[in-house]
Interface confidence: low
């Protein structure tokens, strides 16, 4: 029920904890020598997305056929360990966390496909992967070393009332400025009683620039 | 207690962290063997039951407590016997039931 | 006293999980007393039992030895199977010293 297992029977059994009374952090020093448990895989790093919300798989080798399946997500930071969602499931069905959480997910087969919503720049942090096999017996735990979701605040888009003055500003000048070279053109073509040729033409800015809208996640997958 | 009626047993563990551990009913009738009743997480999230008494038993756990209870209701005369309460010594692993309570007798007969 | 004994015990269905270990354990239930762990998952021996006492078998047939049986040794013998609920237990062995 621990990952105490260690002072009473040693690394002899290839099982997994029912529960979690140790901080992680002990856990995942002492899991690799002492609990060789159902193994969990995670890429290790995540960058969200500029609005927040980052994506990856959590996947686990099943040491059995379990039927109900139980995903928690943990947060790591400054070795505080934290909770951020959890979710129940029967195999073949969907994920469902609570309303208010911000996790969502899909289930497919041994694969979850977590998405946490509303990171800030303060969140980045570690997070952690926790499986349980809750039925049939014999229960099963397994924790994957971790995601290291990075969440970078994007710089604001500049002011659109601040874009249309510029805006206005640069087509003005730009009008007059062809107005002028216009002028001046027909004038000599007038002087000189040449045939009349095309004014010159300015390519026009796009009327709000774009602004980088959001960072693809990337991530490098544990073997 | 008499057949169809109520009764509820308390179990008071020490010497441990009860919250760590998932905690089993089993009942010995008089001259017979073990029978396994009841089992509960340690969060109290699962329960899983013996078919004899599916329905009519009810386990729990109190955390804050140290106490692990089972409401026994609508005895039968073939309820009779004494209920351990033992601890599932899976520190780590499945490691058996590590730890028992005396026991309680009950006695169902009109 | 000081003879080898030895208790069997068998299962109708396989006990080996898929992990590796056969979820059997073995109890003794002293007269008079609550039952107490001899051997957990098949061959791994409790905290605190003498190894006098082995544990020993898989999927479906499995083995109580003990090397010499001594006095405080009496009392039954309680297989049980831990792989799916509901947990079962053997009917008991019920052991003596002439």
């Known amino acids: 029920m621990a990952c105490l297992g260690f002072q009473r029977h040693k690394a002899q059994l290839n099982l997994a904890t029912r529960t979690w009374p140790c901080t992680l952090l002990f856990f995942l020093l002492f899991i690799p020598v002492f609990c060789k448990a159902m193994h969990v895989a995670q890429p290790a790093v995540v960058l969200a997305s500029s609005r927040g919300i980052a994506s990856f798989v959590c996947e686990y080798a099943s040491p059995g056929k379990a039927t109900e399946v139980r995903v928690t997500v943990l947060r790591q930071a400054d070795s505080q360990v934290t909770e951020v969602c959890a979710a129940t499931y029967m195999m073949g069905n969907e994920l469902t966390f609570l309303d208010d959480s911000i996790c969502t997910g899909t289930s497919s087969g041994n694969q979850v496909n977590l998405t946490i919503q509303g990171l800030r720049a303060m969140d980045t942090g570690l997070y952690i992967c926790k499986v349980e096999l809750m039925y049939p017996p014999p229960y099963y735990l397994g924790i994957g070393n971790g995601t290291q979701i990075y969440v970078i605040d994007p710089e604001p888009c500049p002011d659109s009332d601040f874009l249309l003055w510029i805006l206005a500003a640069v087509s003005s000048g730009l009008f007059f400025y062809s107005f002028l070279l216009t002028a001046v053109s027909l004038s000599k073509m007038l002087k000189k009683r040449s045939p009349l040729t095309t004014g010159v033409y300015v390519k026009m800015p796009p009327t709000e620039p774009e602004c980088e809208k959001q960072f693809q996640p990337y991530f490098i997958p544990i073997n | 207690v008499q057949p169809g009626r109520s009764l509820r047993l308390s179990c008071a563990a020490s010497g441990f962290t009860f919250s760590n551990y998932a905690m089993h009913w089993v009942r010995q009738a008089p001259g017979k063997g073990l029978e396994w009743v009841v089992v509960i997480w340690h969060d109290g999230n699962n329960k899983y039951y013996a078919e004899s008494v599916k329905g009519r038993f009810t386990i729990s756990r109190d955390n804050s407590k140290n106490t692990l209870y089972l409401q026994m209701n609508s005895l039968r005369a073939e309820d009779t016997a004494v209920y351990y309460c033992a601890r599932d010594q899976g520190t780590g692993w499945y490691g058996g039931f590590d730890f028992w309570g005396q026991g309680t007798l009950v006695t169902v007969s009109s | 006293p000081g003879e080898p004994a030895s208790i069997s015990c068998r299962s109708s269905?396989?006990?080996?999980?898929?992990?590796?270990?056969?979820?059997l354990d073995w109890y003794l239930q002293k007269p008079g007393q609550s039952p107490q762990l001899l051997i957990y998952l098949g061959s791994n021996r409790a905290s605190g039992v003498p190894d006098r006492f082995s544990g020993s078998g898989s999927g479906t047939d499995f083995t109580l030895k003990l090397s010499r049986v001594e006095a405080e040794d009496v009392g039954v013998y309680y297989c049980m199977q831990a792989l799916q609920t509901p947990l079962t237990f053997g009917g008991g062995t019920k052991v003596e010293i002439k």
């Open positions: 269905q396989s006990l080996l999980h898929s992990n590796g270990y056969n979820y």
